[in-house]
């Protein structure tokens, strides 16, 4: 099985971490995301999740994370404001596609937050200052409760183009292409 | 592996129409959005227009030359995109490619051969 | 429309030596920190074949002489060493917004 890759963000406490998933294809433009965190000898849990469907550009917040699901470009920001280091671990998006399992998005992120504020970011940091202000028309949205018997499945690598280097624009027309990830809240 | 092959090219007289013909095999082909992109002799590249998927409503998008006189549709259950050309204009000769890209608003990581269009009197 | 605009319009490299060509936008290309702007390679007779994509991205199976650089508005793709199997006409593209648009395209020579 191919390893599975991983994105480091190293930020202090306080700021803001600012990803974005992205999924490609239209198909799965209108299908709810989700943002998870993976302990170790855990399934992944969902912390938060777009509205069912997926609406374009819509902030959902769900306590200091905030999910925008950009339609037109493919792409899920999601953002983790006022870093504390207990939010340290490893994240990844999920597409739900129910009644099949969820697509795991590449690449997973490994956040890492320290202590102590770094005062003024580096423009490549993606962070922000302790007060963030919340955008006004934010939405929480009910995450679905997913279970499945199965384990993290993988696939061997494609060897045709669909799967560009280095930022693996993942074609997922097929069921053997994706990370199969059995989701528990 | 991925293949575009175009066809229903050839010589149209100035306010004449042809519709060109793009069959795709190798791929899902419902799953992507399928493009045109046509080259003058000697020319740059210019994008023609380009057709989404079901999901999208096959929402079609074109360039100011062509808005009004060209249609991108396609057939999934044929795996075919098409390009009808009406009211044809002599600086609409050039080779008319059809292009694949890798999602939304993603590179153009796959091409067709090209077919001619030649409009001339 | 978004206006791309290439430079030079040609260009003569010994072999060897380094290629650089600049793609300048008449507007931002750049969806959050993602740059939708790619560069394609077109020999004569032939379709175009992707070289870069969202600006700095080696499109598998080109070789790693090509890179891409930059954001927002200004962009190059560098050939570190040519070739001579690198003499060909080179486009950038962009795809951020639609109508999508390419430029008009460099001439690469060798010297």
């Known amino acids: 099985a191919t390893k599975l890759t991983e994105e480091k963000y190293e930020l202090k406490e306080g700021q803001t971490l600012d990803v974005k998933c992205d999924y490609t294809l239209e198909k799965f433009a209108s299908s709810q995301k989700a943002w998870q965190i993976i302990r170790d000898g855990e399934m992944p849990k969902t912390l938060a999740c777009t509205e069912r469907p997926s609406k374009n550009s819509h902030p959902v917040q769900v306590g200091r994370i905030i999910l925008e699901d950009y339609h037109d470009h493919g792409l899920l920001r999601v953002r983790m404001v006022n870093l504390q280091v207990e939010d340290s671990g490893l994240y990844q998006c999920v597409i739900y596609q129910p009644p099949k399992e969820p697509h795991m998005l590449f690449d997973r992120i490994r956040l890492v937050v320290t202590k102590g504020f770094s005062g003024t970011p580096g423009s490549n940091e993606n962070s922000t200052q302790n007060v963030y202000k919340i955008p006004p028309t934010t939405t929480k949205a009910l995450c679905p409760l997913y279970t499945s018997p199965r384990t993290v499945t993988q696939a061997p690598p494609k060897s045709t183009a669909d799967v560009s280097t280095p930022d693996s624009e993942i074609n997922l027309t097929n069921v053997t292409d994706i990370i199969r990830v059995p989701v528990f809240n | 592996e991925v293949q575009l092959v175009e066809s229903g090219g050839g010589l149209v007289q100035p306010g004449g129409s042809l519709k060109l013909s793009c069959a795709a095999s190798?791929?899902?082909?419902?799953?992507?959005?399928m493009h045109w992109v046509r080259q003058a002799s000697g020319k740059g590249l210019e994008w023609v227009g380009r057709?989404?998927?079901?999901?999208?409503?096959?929402?079609?998008y074109y360039a100011a030359s062509v808005k009004g006189r060209f249609t991108i549709s396609r057939d999934d259950s044929k795996n075919t995109a098409y390009l009808q050309m009406n009211s044809l204009k002599t600086e609409d000769t050039a080779v008319y490619y059809c292009t694949r890209d890798m999602g939304i608003r993603r590179q153009f990581a796959y091409w067709g051969q090209g077919t001619l269009v030649t409009v001339s009197s | 429309d978004i206006v791309l605009t290439q430079s030079p319009d040609s260009l003569a490299v010994s072999l060897g030596e380094r290629a650089t060509i600049n793609c300048r936008a008449s507007?931002?290309?750049?969806?959050?920190?993602?740059?939708?702007l790619h560069w394609y390679q077109q020999k004569p007779g032939q379709p175009p074949k992707l070289l870069i994509y969202r600006a700095s991205n080696l499109e598998s199976g080109v070789p790693d002489r090509f890179s891409g650089s930059g954001s927002g508005t200004d962009f190059t793709l560098t050939i570190s060493s040519l070739q001579a199997e690198d003499v060909a006409v080179y486009y950038c593209q962009q795809s951020n917004e639609d109508p999508y648009t390419f430029g008009q395209g460099t001439k690469l020579e060798i010297k």
């Open positions: 190798g791929f899902t082909f419902s799953t992507y959005a």
């Open positions: 057709i989404r998927t079901k999901s999208s409503n096959y929402a079609t």
């Open positions: 507007q931002s290309v750049d969806t959050f920190d993602y740059s939708f």
